[in-house]
Structure formats: structure tokens, C-alpha cells
Amino acid sequence: SGTTNTVAAYNLTWKSTNFKTILEWEPKPVNQVYTVQISTKSGDWKSKCFYTTDTECDLTDEIVKDVKQTYLARVFSYPAGNVESTGSAGEPLYENSPEFTPYLETNLGQPTIQSFEQVGTKVNVTVEDERTLVRRNNTFLSLRDVFGKDLIYTLYYWKSSSSGKKTAKTNTNEFLIDVDKGENYCFSVQAVIPSRTVNRKSTDSPVECMGQEKGEFREI
């Protein structure tokens, strides 16, 4: 029935934060639809987002099965209303994505300071252990569960009256820092995976300052 005017997808891009993973591509479809397939290097192709007019596909459910695997996706283009039709080579047009290894490449989401507590000249700062969509034994794992000691947090802290930011680091979710008595401090944290060469750091958490809601002060 003649050739069809479908165009191949392009600019296939992985967008992933804390393992929530979406494949995006172009162009916006005109008289065509898309289907996505995903596979590990050694596995079979699995189809997702069938005949969609979207230019994104949430592949989280697939990649969380094994975040240390390397995945490849491909996007097929079909004529709208005639998805059985194929390209001139006898099969639908498709484009491959770059390879994606979630454990090495997912962006670290913005962390949150859960609480801070001052006892005398020490302050304990706790970072919220964010839940991911990675599951083990039907339970969602936290970021710390997934990354273990590969994940560290950097705490930036400073006197409210000063600009210089001191740093502390931890491979747990807690910091214990020394502060000057009678001074108010502000805090911000960053998640870091030091062993990475790309996507090493999260954006900074919102700044929290002593004398505000989150903290607790105890004079000892």
C-alpha cells in the first residue's frame, strides 16, 4: 500500500533522578505514534508505552529490577491509525537510545534536612533518607539502602552572622559538629557519590537555620 511518511525518533535522552527514570525523545508526532522497547545487554526486548503520542516513556518499573545492569531502549515510529504498516525496509523505523546504567548515572535528588538538635556545643544534623522506587522483598528501598557507603553527604554550615561555609562529611545520614555557644548556625546538605565521574552531586538541600521550626535546642 505504498510507503508511509513516518520519521524516526531522535534526541533520545534518559532523565533519571533517584531511579525514577523516563526516556524522552523528539519530535512531537504528526500522524504517527510511538512504541518503546527496553532491554538489558543480554536480555530480551520488552515493549512499553504502546502506540503513544507522548514523547516520553516512564521506564522506572523496568530499570528498578536491577539498577546495576546496563539498559538500552529503542523507540519505534508507526503511522497513526495504521500501526501494522512498516517502513520501506519491511519493518518500522526505530532509533536506539544511549546505554544507561542507573546505579552509575541516575541523578541524586535534592536532599532534605530532617532535623537538627543542639546539645551544648554539639549539633546533630540528620538528613532524610529518601525512599526510592527500587524494591526488595516487596519493600521500597531508601537511597542509603541502594547505595550503601558509596553515598556520602556533605554538610555546609555557617554562623548566621558570617559568610564562610565550613564543611563536614558523613557516610551515614547523620552529622555531629562542633559549634560556638550562643551562635545561630545555618545548614545545607549535598548528596555525593565520590566514585562517580559524572552526576556526582545533588543540588543543595533547602537551607535550614537554628531558631527555626526544624531544630531543637537543649542547654546542657
Epitope: 556520602i152 556533605t154 555546609y156 559568610s163 564562610g164 561555609k165 565550613k166 564543611t167 563536614a168 562529611k169 558523613t170 557516610n171 559538629i177 562542633d178 545545607s188 549535598q190 555525593v192 565520590p194 562517580r196 565521574t197 559524572v198 552526576n199 556526582r200 552531586k201 543540588t203 543543595d204
Partner: antibody, heavy 120, light 107 residues
Framework: EVQLVESGGGLVQLGGSLRLSCAAS????????IHWVRQAPGKGLEWVGY????????YYADSVKGRFTISADTSKNTAYLQMNSLRAEDTAVYYC?????????????WGQGTLVTVSS | DIQMTQSPSSLSASVGDRVTITCRAS??????VAWYQQKPGKAPKLLIY???FLYSGVPSRFSGSRSGTDFTLTISSLQPEDFATYYC?????????FGQGTKVEIK
């Protein structure tokens, strides 16, 4: 290959100013912390200050606070050390170094250094 | 600021000798201590991080250990290329501080 290259050193008058550059290649400075460390002739290493280029946060040694400013331009992948009100005791080789931001905070790569001489 | 007191300030040794350099922190720094080697006219090079971990490419004759606030760099069998100055550094808190250095000279 990871490399840090300092430039901008030289002879400067007492009370004068100088800007040092630290050009990075083989990695993106936004993912790391960059420190400046100096070494006076025949002396040991003295930490000067740091910048986290991802957020602009800095901290300085007391000996340079208020006189030195560290900045970074992530588009140029370069960190800078602006030195004002220079004193004789600021004469040193100045190094920039990369902090991988591990828990122990070691400096894994250093530049070759640039000599700053403050003369009266 | 945390002081790192390094000793000795210099030592003379022969090729094949076992050499030990120590650093004492003025307060707890956990394992956040690194050791660097510096040769004249050159930048320092990282040898040991996290008190006892050998940096990649560094010969296995170098080792580091910790006992409380005392940190030790050991060269098990000194080689000609090891004659240099060695520095310890803590980065447990800001500002990071260096020891005064130990110059290892040929006997």
C-alpha cells in the same frame, strides 16, 4: 586525563593585587571542590581556602580572610584566586587542588603551582 | 583549628630501610587523614587516604595506619625515589590542616 594548570603568578608590589587562575581539564569542576594551597619558600603546605563551584560556597584561612577571594566559572572550567592587599608573607608557590568530596576529603590532583613574589 | 603535629621533622635513612613517620591530631579526626609526598619543585602527590587506603598507582611499600588520634606512614623498604618530604593532612573539619612535614634524606 585529569589536569589542573595554574597561571597568573609573578612579582607584585606590597599592597598590590594579583589574580591566579586554575584551569581544569579531564573533569568538570562543578562536580568537585577546588582548594588553593600555598607553600612559602622552604616551608610547609598551608591551606588557603576552597570553593564549591556548584553553589559558590567558600571558606578561607584566617591569614587571608578579607583579602583573598576564590571564585569559579563553570563554563570555563576554571577557578580563580583574587589576592588583594598583598603582604610579604604571601610570597609562596600557590597550588590548586581537587577534592573528590569523599568522607576523608583528600586532594587527589594538584596543579604544578605558580609562584607569587611580593616585593617591597 | 585542628593541629597536626608531625614527627620527626627530618630523618636520614638508607635504601632498604623501614621508615616510619607519625602525625598526632589535636582532637579526634576519625580516619579523615591523608598523606602526601612532595619532591623539590613539584606539587604534592597523594599517597594514602582515609588513614590507611593506598591511592591508585602508589607502590605497596607505602602504608598508613591509625591508633586513636595518632597516624603513621610507613615505607617498608625505602627506595631511591622515596627521598622526599612527606606531609599528613586532616580534613575532618574545615579548615583542613597539614603537618609540618618530614624530610627523608639519604644517610
Amino acid at each position: 586525563e585529569v589536569q589542573l594548570v595554574e597561571s597568573g603568578g609573578g612579582l607584585v608590589q606590597l599592597g598590590g593585587s594579583l589574580r591566579l587562575s586554575c584551569a581544569a581539564s579531564g573533569f568538570t569542576i562543578g562536580g568537585y571542590i577546588i582548594h588553593w594551597v600555598r607553600q612559602a619558600p622552604g616551608k610547609g603546605l598551608e591551606w588557603v581556602g576552597y570553593i564549591d563551584p556548584s553553589n559558590g560556597y567558600t571558606y578561607y584561612a584566617d591569614s587571608v580572610k578579607g583579602r583573598f577571594t576564590i571564585s569559579a566559572d563553570t563554563s570555563k572550567n576554571t577557578a580563580y584566586l583574587q589576592m588583594n592587599s598583598l603582604r610579604a608573607e604571601d610570597t609562596a608557590v600557590y597550588y590548586c587542588a581537587r577534592d573528590i568530596q569523599s568522607v576523608s576529603g583528600e586532594f587527589d590532583y594538584w596543579g604544578q603551582g605558580t609562584l607569587v613574589t611580593v616585593s617591597s | 583549628d585542628i593541629q597536626m603535629t608531625q614527627s620527626p621533622s627530618s630523618l636520614s635513612a638508607s635504601v632498604g630501610d623501614r621508615v616510619t613517620i607519625t602525625c598526632r591530631a589535636s582532637q579526634d579526626v576519625n580516619t579523615a587523614v591523608a598523606w602526601y609526598q612532595q619532591k623539590p619543585g613539584k606539587a604534592p602527590k597523594l599517597l594514602i587516604y582515609s588513614a590507611s587506603f593506598l591511592y591508585s598507582g602508589v607502590p605497596s611499600r607505602f602504608s598508613g595506619s591509625r591508633s586513636g588520634t595518632d597516624f603513621t606512614l610507613t615505607i617498608s623498604s625505602l627506595q631511591p625515589e622515596d627521598f622526599a618530604t612527606y606531609y599528613c593532612q586532616q580534613h575532618y573539619t574545615t579548615p583542613p590542616t597539614f603537618g609540618q612535614g618530614t624530610k627523608v634524606e639519604i644517610k
